[in-house]
């Protein structure tokens, strides 16, 4: 028995950031799971991992240097990515594994989401000074 995953076919990352929602045919509430986002047709690059342990705080990390965060819904995980580069335009696949309670479950491969990273507009208006941070 496999979990089905739905993703948007395409997203555009403006300002080098994007939110990708992975919707599952499975309720993740009170489950131990590992949700991950993979880059490339062969899913060779694991972009981000969101580890959930029942109703506790999500643990988020990337072994490949991506700046990411995750939000959990009952039947979804949304990945938030920052500081994307134009050359990271690619197809991204959601993956889900449920470790507990048994039985172990994972997903049928989804259709993926093409994330198109638009370059930052680097020409400031001459009327306004550069931004200032507190």
């Amino acid at each position: 028995n496999k979990i089905l995953v739905k993703q948007s076919p395409m997203l555009v990352a403006y300002d080098n950031a994007v939110n990708l929602s992975c919707k599952y045919s499975y309720n993740l509430f009170s489950r131990e799971f590992r949700a991950s986002l993979h880059k490339g047709l062969d899913s060779a690059v694991e972009v981000c991992v969101v580890y959930g342990n029942y109703s506790q705080q999500l643990q988020v990390y990337s072994k490949t240097g991506f700046n990411c965060d995750g939000k959990l819904g009952n039947e979804s995980v949304t990945f938030y990515l920052q500081n994307l580069y134009v050359n990271q335009t690619d197809i991204y696949f959601c993956k889900i594994e449920v470790m507990y309670p048994p039985p172990y479950l994972d997903n049928e491969k989804s259709n993926g989401t093409i994330i198109h990273v638009k370059g930052k507009h680097l020409c400031p208006s001459p009327l306004f000074p550069g931004p200032s941070k507190p």
Epitope: V50, Q57, L58, Q59, V60, Y61, S62, G65, F66, N67, C68, D69, G70, K71, L72, Q82, N83, Y85, G130, K133, P134
Partner: antibody
Framework: EVQLVESGGGLVQPGGSLRLSCAAF????????MHWVRQAPGKGLVWVSR????????SFADSVRGRFTISRDNAKNTLYLQLNSLRAEDTAVYYC?????????????WGQGTLVTVSS | EIVLTQSPATLSLSPGERATLSCRAS??????LAWYQQKPGQAPRLLIY???NRATGIPARFSGSGSGTDFTLTISSLEPEDFAVYYC?????????FGQGTKVEIK
């Protein structure tokens, strides 16, 4: 004026535990990601952990993952770092830092730090 | 993770002189680089973000430049309060990392 005040540091034996606190003043705490950064005596800065604005997600440096936990109480405007299974190499000044509102890992305000010494 | 290498380790200068500090990244960080100042016994303070933007309240004598792998922090004319340790930090890749610091000391 933004102010971050750490407390809870001290001397602890290897294998012991400690809980650090960071009280926040002068800004809407619940709107910001928060971080812990440490500095061993005479050494440079090393990022330790972060928590998002509502406390629902966290990340940790490899060196502390599984030993440290981060949490926050937005009602009390306070950030916490629970340090377990402490090692000599965890000896450092621990700073809490606020992330810039638009950049998760840009640290725009820092506390004065609290010293953790792990020694037998 | 990205390694940031700062040079020189120590810079001995007199007040009024120009200070040039370097930070080199092990791979491109685009313009996602910040500079912090730390005085003895004090917390770090954000000076420059996104390679060249001054943080609020930072004097104009501090300027940053560079992109990709090579970055520079310049203090055009050193004031007595500028003698401190300076750190660069990247936020391009996770985890965020800092350089080992450059100490600017009075000659």
């Amino acid at each position: 004026e933004v102010q971050l005040v750490e407390s809870g540091g001290g001397l602890v034996q290897p294998g012991g535990s400690l809980r650090l606190s960071c009280a926040a003043f002068g800004f809407t705490f619940s709107n910001y990601w928060m971080h812990w950064v440490r500095q061993a005596p005479g050494k440079g800065l090393v990022w330790v952990s972060r928590i998002n604005s509502d406390g629902s997600s966290a990340s940790f440096a490899d060196s502390v993952r599984g030993r440290f936990t981060i949490s926050r109480d937005n009602a009390k405007n306070t950030l916490y770092l629970q340090l377990n299974s402490l090692r000599a190499e965890d000896t450092a000044v621990y700073y809490c830092a606020r992330a810039d509102s638009s950049s998760w890992y840009l640290f725009d305000n820092w506390g004065q730090g609290t010293l953790v010494t792990v020694s037998s | 993770e990205i390694v940031l290498t700062q040079s020189p380790a120590t810079l001995s200068l007199s007040p009024g002189e120009r200070a040039t500090l370097s930070c080199r990244a092990s791979q491109s960080v685009s313009s996602y680089l910040a500079w912090y100042q730390q005085k003895p016994g004090q917390a770090p303070r954000l000076l420059i973000y996104d390679a060249s933007n001054r943080a609020t309240g930072i004097p104009a004598r501090f300027s940053g430049s560079g992109s990709g792998t090579d970055f520079t922090l310049t203090i055009s004319s050193l004031e007595p309060e500028d003698f401190a340790v300076y750190y660069c930090q990247q936020r391009s890749n996770w985890p965020p990392t800092f350089g080992q610091g450059t100490k600017v000391e009075i000659k």
